[in-house]
């Protein structure tokens, strides 16, 4: 592989690494969306909620003079409950219905697939760099692109979950905004998907420049 190509691959891998960090952050944190109730709902405090793939947290926040609920970073009494995805016999203490359990199960499962693709892609990259097997960058690029797509699907499932929670008559939440975990997931999708495609492009052998050349005449790989 030529020096310029190697440089392009390294820059791409750096972008993919940033995507991996963002994806991991999004998956393990629970600030995908912040939900708030009617402002008149409480006199001095309001009960906002923020949630992720694994749990929902409610927080009693002191209301300011502008009668707004938040920001969620303000100190307050916090109550978190994990979605019991994989032990259906047990029920979550709070918000069993209102969290749209089937949506969070789907989003969490797809996010795990995404992490699986990231691990497979990273293994291929490590083997490629360690043993100079450039051809392993091609499956790695595909794994990263698939990981990006899985993150995108998780994002869309969570968007639908938020919409249903806001629309549901069985919740008090009336307003919402997407928070930093959601932003991390969106950025991770862009970096992983585009990074994967770029890596695939840079790891392909040089196409013949002249009609009489064949792929066999291209620069040999290590």
């Amino acid at each position: 592989m030529s020096q310029t190509k190697m440089l392009k691959v390294r820059v791409t891998l750096f972008c993919i690494l940033a995507g991996i960090v963002l994806a991991m952050t999004a998956v393990v944190t629970d600030h995908w969306a912040v939900l708030s109730p009617h402002m008149e709902h409480h006199n001095t405090t309001c009960e906002a909620a923020h949630f992720g793939l694994w749990r929902i947290c409610t927080k009693r926040i002191p209301m300011d003079d502008s009668k707004t609920c938040g920001p969620i970073t303000l100190p307050g009494e916090k109550n978190c409950s994990y979605f019991r995805h994989f032990n259906p016999g047990e029920s979550s203490e709070i918000f069993e219905f209102t969290t749209q359990k089937e949506y969070s199960i789907s989003a969490a499962a797809i996010a795990i697939f995404s992490l699986g693709f990231i691990i497979l892609g990273s293994l291929c990259v490590l083997l490629s760099l360690g043993k100079k097997r450039d051809y392993l960058l091609r499956p790695a690029s595909m794994f990263y692109a698939f990981a990006g797509l899985c993150i995108l699907v998780s994002v869309e499932v969570m968007r639908q979950s938020v919409k249903r929670m806001i629309d549901s008559e069985d919740t008090v939440w009336i307003e919402y905004y997407y928070s930093w975990s959601f932003a991390c997931a969106c950025a991770a999708f862009i970096l992983l998907f585009l990074g994967g495609l770029a890596l695939l492009l840079f790891s392909l052998p040089r196409m013949p420049r002249n009609p009489w050349e064949s792929c066999m005449d291209a620069e040999p790989e290590h």
Partner: antibody
Framework: QVQLQESGPGLVKPSETLSLTCTVS????????WTWLRQPPGKGLEWIGY???????NYNPSLKSRVTISVDTSKNQFSLKLNSVTAADTAVYYC??????????WGQGTLVTVSS | EIVLTQSPGTLSLSPGERATLSCRAS???????LAWYQQRPGQAPRLLIY???NRATAIPDRFSGSGSGTDFTLTISRLEPEDFEVYSC?????????FGGGTKVEIK
């Protein structure tokens, strides 16, 4: 399918306390919000207030000083108490599932007349 | 509190005709959080529309909702005999929740 049924006296004397109970069947009272509404004869509906199964409640400011909503999870029931009633409190009282949005599941309603 | 005014008070139409019911709010309703109900005498209200335009489960597609801000409309495209009832609007954009006085749709 969740079903709600209101019960209580149909006649209450002025200045006394109106007490109604809503029994929920077909679903657990847990994890949901439960609301009381009323409709005076020939008039529109009025939201009274709601309670969460944990016991936290919120009321219409116009009735807040007179109203108490409580919940009994063991009996799958929630109740309404309205103090110092007058003829203006004569209405069909409904219980419903939900809190501060729209209401899909309603009881059949019970007419309460305030008269001496 | 938000006051909802429904017009007309009574609407006289024939089966098969189109009914247009209006609900006007005294101030803007946040996020178009408005619901429509149908109420038969001696029965509890039945949810038709929520979020100004979303049809509730099992509601026929002849019922549709539209509008935003302060002006909202419930349209029944072709009136069926069972549609001649009272219709109420309800806002849930701010507390306290409030309801309109209702529009009675009667057979001409």
């Amino acid at each position: 399918q969740v079903q709600l049924q209101e019960s209580g006296p149909g006649l209450v004397k002025p200045s006394e306390t109106l007490s109604l109970t809503c029994t929920v069947s077909g679903d657990s009272i847990n994890n949901y919000y439960w609301t009381w509404l009323r409709q005076p004869p020939g008039k529109g509906l009025e939201w009274i207030g709601y309670i969460y199964y944990s016991g936290s409640a919120n009321y219409n400011p116009s009735l807040k000083s007179r109203v108490t909503i409580s919940v009994d999870t063991s009996k799958n029931q929630f109740s309404l108490k309205l103090n110092s009633v007058t003829a203006a409190d004569t209405a069909v009282y409904y219980c419903a599932r939900g809190a501060v949005k729209y209401f899909r599941h309603w009881g059949q309603g019970t007419l309460v007349t305030v008269s001496s | 509190e938000i006051v909802l005014t429904q017009s007309p008070g009574t609407l006289s139409l024939s089966p098969g005709e189109r009914a247009t019911l209006s609900c006007r709010a005294s101030q803007t309703i946040n996020h178009n959080n408005l619901a429509w109900y149908q109420q038969r005498p001696g029965q509890a209200p039945r949810l038709l529309i929520y979020g100004a335009s979303n049809r509730a489960t099992a509601i026929p597609d002849r019922f549709s909702g539209s509008g935003s801000g302060t002006d909202f409309t419930l349209t029944i495209s072709r009136l069926e005999p069972e549609d001649f009832e009272v219709y109420s609007c309800q806002q849930y954009g701010s507390l306290p929740l409030t309801f309109g006085g209702g529009t009675k749709v009667e057979i001409k």
